[in-house]
C-alpha cells in the first residue's frame, strides 16, 4: 500500500504590482531518484476560507526533494482582501496503474498584503497600476469605519461597486479608455452625514494599445547598409516615464543577429561582406505590456534604392537640340541602371527612358528656340526594379532662332487731299514663332509706280503700329520682325492708288452674347483671302482696332471676344485680298453684341402752343451715341379727358397710373404736333426713345397748359 504523497511546506509569497500569489511546496515520501507525474489541485478563497473563488489543477513531473512553483494572478488587488490557499495532490503516472486517490488538503495558508497602515481611515487600491486600453480592471476601497458612507469617482463621475465585506467594496471597470498620458484619476470619499472624513485617490495608467508596425520595408543604396523604415503608429508612452515609448528591435534570422533601434521609425543594418543575399527580418515593437512583430523576407539585389544622379549638365545647346549628361553613384561592377528623364517646358512634359552603365547621356531634340526647359533624371536598378531614386534636375535655355513666321499685318487707309495716310498695324509674334526677343520691326515701303524708290523704317519693339503718309501712287509695304539672330519672313500688303470703294452701304447686324456672326458675298475674281476689321463706333479708330484673317473659300465668320461690351456699337468692314495683295472693301456692317435700353431721354422743346395744339420737338437728340439702335419714340400724354386723342392709345405706366401713348417708328422723326386739344386745359407729356431692349429711363412729365382761344402766343 502506497502512502499518499501530500504536499507539504506550502509557502505563499505575493507580488503586489502583478497582483499575483506565488506558491511553492514540496512532496513528502517520494521514492529516492524517482520521477512521478502528479496532479495538484489548488483552492483559493477570499476573505474567509469558505468563500472559494478559484479551483484549478496543475500537472507536472515531480522529482525527489524538488521544490514546486506555481503562480496565480488575481483580478482584485491583493491589498483589498485576505486570501487563503490550500493544495492537495494525486499521482497520475503509468508506473502506478492501480486506482489513485487524492491526498488530504494541506492546511490553509493565509495571505494578507497589509498596506492599510497609518492613521488613515480609507484606502484605495491598486497603486499606480499600468493596464492597456480596453482591458477590464478591478479596484477597491478599504474603509476602517463601517459607519462611513463611501462614494467613489472615476474622472469626477461616480462609480458603483460590489461590497465584498463591510469594510471592502470592489469596482469592476470594464474596457477602460485611454484618457491622458498622465493617467486616469479615481478617488473615494468617506463621509458621515454631510461631513467629509477624508479622501483617498489612485492613478490608473492606461496605455494605448501597441500597434503592429505598418509599411515595414528595407532597402540599400550602396550594398553596405540596409535602411529599414516603418510606420510606428501610436506612441504608447505614458507620463512620468511610467511607460516609455515602445522600443523597436530588428532580428535577422539567417545570421541570428539582433539590433535595438534608436529611432522610432527607422533603423540601419550593416551589411556584412559575406555575400549574404537573402534577408529575413523580424521587426519587434515592444512596451511594458505587449510585443508586436512583422516579418519581411527579401533578396538584397531586389531592394536597391539608388542615390540620386549627380553632375547634371547640358552640352552643345543650340536653338532646337541639347545633350543632357549626368553621373550615377557606382555601387557594383557591371551594374546596369535604368534612368528616366523628364523634360518640362512650354507647359508640356516629355518622358524618356534610357539604359546606362556609369555615365548617362541623352540627346534632346525638337526643342523650341529661346525656351527655358527644366530637365531632371532619376535612376533605378535595371535588372530588378525596386524604386526610382530621387530626381536630380537642372534648367537650361535653348538659343534664339530667327523668327519663323511673318507678322500679321493690317492697315487703315484714310484719304486726304493729295495723299493717303496709312496707319499700319501688326500683331506681336507668338512665343512659338518669335523664337526669341523681338528687338525691332523693319517696315519697307516701295513705290510700285517708281520701282527704284523704297524707304526703310526701323521701329523698335514693342511698338505695334506706325503711320505712313504716301502720295497717290500704289505702294507695296513689307513688315519684317527681327530678333538677335535674324529676320522673319516679310508680310506684304499693297496700297492701291485708287480710292477705296465708297459706294458700300452699311448694314445693321445683331450680335449675340457669343459675338457677331458675319457673312458676305464672295469677291468676283481670284482672292487670296478676306480680312474683317472692327472697332468701337464711338471711339478713335486707333483705340481698339482689331482684325481677323479669313481663308479664300470662306464667306462667313464668327467674331467672338471677351472685349465686346453690352451697349457698345461696333463697326465691321470686310475686305477681299486680290492675288496682287490689294484690299478691296466689300461690305460694311454695324451692330451691338447686346443692345441696351437708351441711357437718356431727349431734351424736348414745346413750340407753337395754341389753344388747340402744341408742337413737341427734340431735334438735338443724337441717335448715334446710344447703347442700342433707336427704333423710334414713345410719346406719353396725360389729360383730364376720359378718351385718348386720335392716334394715341391707352397705356398703363409702371406706377400703375393710366395715360395715353403714341408710338413714332422713325428714329429720325423728332417732332410731333399734338392737336385736338381744349383751350385752358392742363396736359402732361413725356417722350422716351426705345431700342429692341426697351425704353429709356422713366422721368417726370412736363406740364403744358393751353391758353384760351383769345390769347395769342
Amino acid at each position: 500500500e502506497r502512502l499518499p504523497l501530500t504536499p507539504v511546506s506550502l509557502k505563499v509569497s505575493t507580488n503586489s504590482t502583478r497582483q499575483s500569489l506565488h506558491l511553492q511546496w514540496t512532496v513528502h515520501n517520494l521514492p529516492y531518484h524517482q520521477e512521478l507525474k502528479m496532479v495538484f489541485q489548488i483552492q483559493i478563497s477570499r476573505i474567509e476560507t469558505s468563500n472559494v473563488i478559484w479551483v484549478g489543477n496543475y500537472s507536472t513531473t515531480v522529482k525527489w526533494n524538488q521544490v514546486l512553483h506555481w503562480s496565480w494572478e488575481s483580478e482584485l488587488p491583493l491589498e483589498c482582501a485576505t486570501h487563503f490557499v490550500r493544495i492537495k495532490s494525486l499521482v497520475d503516472d503509468a508506473k502506478f496503474p492501480e486506482p489513485n486517490f487524492w491526498s488530504n488538503w494541506s492546511s490553509w495558508e493565509e495571505v494578507s498584503v497589509q498596506d492599510s497602515t497609518g492613521q488613515d481611515i480609507l484606502f484605495v487600491f491598486p497603486k499606480d497600476k499600468l493596464v492597456e486600453e480596453g482591458t477590464n480592471v478591478t479596484i477597491c476601497y478599504v474603509s476602517r469605519n463601517i459607519q462611513n458612507n463611501v462614494s467613489c469617482y472615476l474622472e469626477g463621475k461616480q462609480i458603483h461597486g460590489e461590497q465584498l465585506d463591510p469594510h471592502v467594496t470592489a469596482f469592476n471597470l470594464n474596457s477602460v479608455p485611454f484618457i491622458r498620458n498622465k493617467g486616469t484619476n479615481i478617488y473615494c470619499e468617506a463621509s458621515q452625514g454631510n461631513v467629509s472624513e477624508g479622501m483617498k485617490g489612485i492613478v490608473l495608467f492606461v496605455s494605448k494599445v501597441l500597434e503592429e508596425p505598418k509599411d515595414f520595408s528595407c532597402e540599400t543604396e550602396d550594398f553596405k547598409t540596409l535602411h529599414c523604415t516603418w510606420d510606428p503608429g501610436t506612441d504608447t508612452a505614458l507620463g512620468w516615464s511610467k511607460q516609455p515609448s515602445q522600443s523597436y528591435t530588428l532580428f535577422e534570422s539567417f545570421s541570428g543577429e539582433k539590433k535595438l533601434c534608436t529611432h522610432k521609425n527607422w533603423c540601419n543594418w550593416q551589411i556584412t561582406q559575406d555575400s549574404q543575399e537573402t534577408y529575413n527580418f523580424t521587426l519587434i515593437a515592444e512596451n511594458y505590456l505587449r510585443k508586436r512583430s512583422v516579418n519581411i523576407l527579401f533578396n538584397l539585389t531586389h531592394r536597391v534604392y539608388l542615390m540620386n544622379p549627380f553632375s547634371v549638365n547640358f552640352e552643345n545647346v543650340n536653338a532646337t537640340n541639347a545633350i543632357m549628361t549626368w553621373k550615377v553613384h557606382s555601387i557594383r561592377n557591371n551594374f546596369t541602371y535604368l534612368c528616366q528623364i523628364e523634360l518640362h517646358g512650354e507647359g508640356k512634359m516629355m518622358q524618356y527612358n534610357v539604359s546606362i552603365k556609369v555615365n548617362g547621356e541623352y540627346f534632346l531634340s525638337e526643342l523650341e528656340p529661346a525656351t527655358e526647359y527644366m530637365a531632371r533624371v532619376r535612376c533605378a536598378d535595371a535588372s530588378h526594379f525596386w524604386k526610382w531614386s530621387e530626381w536630380s534636375g537642372q534648367n537650361f535655355t535653348t538659343l534664339e532662332a530667327a523668327p519663323s513666321e511673318a507678322p500679321d499685318v493690317w492697315r487703315i487707309v484714310s484719304l486726304e487731299p493729295g495723299n493717303h495716310t496709312v496707319t499700319l498695324f501688326w500683331k506681336p509674334l507668338s512665343k512659338l514663332h518669335a523664337n526669341g526677343k523681338i528687338l525691332f520691326y523693319n517696315v519697307v515701303v516701295e513705290n510700285l509706280d517708281k520701282p527704284s524708290s523704297s524707304e526703310l523704317h526701323s521701329i523698335p519693339a514693342p511698338a505695334n503700329s506706325t503711320k505712313l503718309i504716301l502720295d497717290r501712287c500704289s505702294y507695296q509695304i513689307c513688315v519684317i520682325a527681327n530678333n538677335s539672330v535674324g529676320a522673319s519672313p516679310a508680310s506684304v500688303i499693297v496700297i492701291s492708288a485708287d480710292p477705296e470703294n465708297k459706294e458700300v452701304e452699311e448694314e445693321r447686324i445683331a450680335g449675340t452674347e457669343g459675338g457677331f456672326s458675319l457673312s458676305w458675298k464672295p469677291q468676283p475674281g481670284d482672292v487670296i483671302g478676306y480680312v474683317v476689321d472692327w472697332c468701337d463706333h464711338t471711339q478713335d479708330v486707333l483705340g481698339d482696332f482689331q482684325w481677323k484673317n479669313v481663308g479664300p473659300n470662306t464667306t462667313s465668320t464668327v467674331i467672338s471676344t471677351d472685349a465686346f461690351r453690352p451697349g457698345v456699337r461696333y463697326d465691321f468692314r470686310i475686305y477681299g485680298l486680290s492675288t496682287k495683295r490689294i484690299a478691296c472693301l466689300l461690305e460694311k456692317k454695324t451692330g451691338y453684341s447686346q443692345e441696351l435700353a437708351p441711357s437718356d431721354n431727349p431734351h424736348v422743346l414745346v413750340d407753337t402752343l395754341t389753344s388747340h395744339s402744341f408742337t413737341l420737338s427734340w431735334k438735338d437728340y443724337s441717335t448715334e451715341s446710344q447703347p442700342g439702335f433707336i427704333q423710334g419714340y414713345h410719346v406719353y400724354l396725360k389729360s383730364k379727358a376720359r378718351q385718348c386723342h386720335p392716334r394715341f392709345e391707352k397705356a398703363v405706366l409702371s406706377d400703375g397710373s393710366e395715360c395715353c401713348k403714341y408710338k413714332i417708328d422713325n428714329p429720325e422723326e423728332k417732332a410731333l404736333i399734338v392737336d385736338n386739344l381744349k383751350p385752358e386745359s392742363f396736359y402732361e407729356f413725356f417722350i422716351t426713345p426705345f431700342t429692341s431692349a426697351g425704353e429709356g429711363p422713366s422721368a417726370t412729365f412736363t406740364k403744358v397748359t393751353t391758353p384760351d382761344e383769345h390769347s395769342s402766343m
Partner: antibody, heavy 126, light 110 residues
C-alpha cells in the same frame, strides 16, 4: 488640527535664491501631495508645481522649469520650495497647499487644494 | 493672460443669486474636474468647490458648482455681505501639464 505653517518673509536681491519651508502637522505628511502657488500684489493665483512627499517626485509649471526645486524632509514633515535667479517680477506671496485627496500614488493628480499655508512674502529688490 | 477666462467683477445685493462663469478649452475644463476658491483680502485662498459640484465640510450649501463642455460656473444664492471676496476657478490642463487658474472675479455685495 490639520495645518501648514510657512517660514517668514524674505528680502532678496536680483539674481539671488530663496528657500521657503512649509511644515505640515495634524495628518500623515507622506499621504498628501504638496502644491506651491504664488500671488503677486493685486494679481491672480499662479501655480508653480507639485511634489509627492512619499516618492519625492516633482512636476513644475513650464514657466518655472529649471528655476524652481521642490524638496521635502519626511522626518520633520516639511516641504521646501527653492527658487533661483530671482528677478523683481518674482516679488509675491508664496503659498504651499495640500491636495484634498490623499493619493495612493508615486505621481500626481490634481483634485483641489484644501489646506493652505499662511503665505510667505518674498520681495526681490536691488 | 490667464488660461481660464473669468469676468473681472460681479456684484449683487444681499439675498440675491449671483453666478460667476469660467471658460476654458477641451484640454482643461473640457476633460478635467473644476475647483473653485475664494480669497478674502490679506488671507490665503480657501477651497469652496471640488470635483465640479462637491463642497468641503464647512462650506454652506448656498455655494454650488456646475460644468458644461469646456465652461464651468459657480452660483451663490442668498448672497451675504461676507461673500465679498475674490473668486478663482481652477483645473488641470492636459496640454500645459499643470494646474491653471482663472484670472479671478471680484465679487461686490452692494
Amino acid at each position: 488640527q490639520v495645518q501648514l505653517v510657512q517660514s517668514g518673509a524674505e528680502v532678496k536681491k536680483p539674481g539671488a535664491s530663496v528657500k521657503v519651508s512649509c511644515k505640515a502637522s495634524g495628518y500623515t505628511f507622506t499621504s498628501y501631495e504638496i502644491n506651491w502657488v504664488r500671488q503677486a500684489t493685486g494679481q491672480g493665483l499662479e501655480w508653480m508645481g507639485w511634489m509627492n512627499p512619499n516618492s519625492g517626485y516633482t512636476g513644475y509649471a513650464q514657466k518655472f522649469q529649471g528655476r524652481v526645486t521642490m524638496t521635502r524632509d519626511t522626518s520633520i514633515s516639511t516641504a521646501y520650495m527653492e527658487m533661483s535667479s530671482l528677478r523683481s517680477e518674482d516679488t509675491a506671496v508664496y503659498y504651499c497647499a495640500r491636495d484634498i485627496v490623499a493619493a495612493n500614488t508615486d505621481y500626481y493628480f490634481y483634485y483641489g487644494m484644501d489646506v493652505w499655508g499662511q503665505g510667505t512674502t518674498v520681495t526681490v529688490s536691488s | 493672460q490667464s488660461v481660464l477666462t473669468q469676468p473681472p467683477s460681479a456684484s449683487g445685493t444681499p439675498g440675491q443669486r449671483v453666478t460667476i462663469s469660467c471658460s476654458g478649452s477641451n484640454s482643461n475644463i473640457g476633460s478635467n474636474t473644476v475647483n473653485w476658491y475664494h480669497q478674502l483680502p490679506g488671507t490665503a485662498p480657501k477651497l469652496l468647490i471640488y470635483n465640479i459640484n462637491k463642497r468641503p465640510s464647512g462650506v454652506p450649501d448656498r455655494f454650488s458648482g456646475s460644468k458644461s463642455g469646456s465652461s464651468a460656473s459657480l452660483a451663490i444664492s442668498g448672497l451675504q455681505s461676507e461673500d465679498e471676496a475674490d473668486y478663482y476657478c481652477s483645473t488641470w490642463d492636459d496640454s500645459l501639464d499643470g494646474v491653471v487658474f482663472g484670472g479671478g472675479t471680484k465679487l461686490t455685495v452692494l
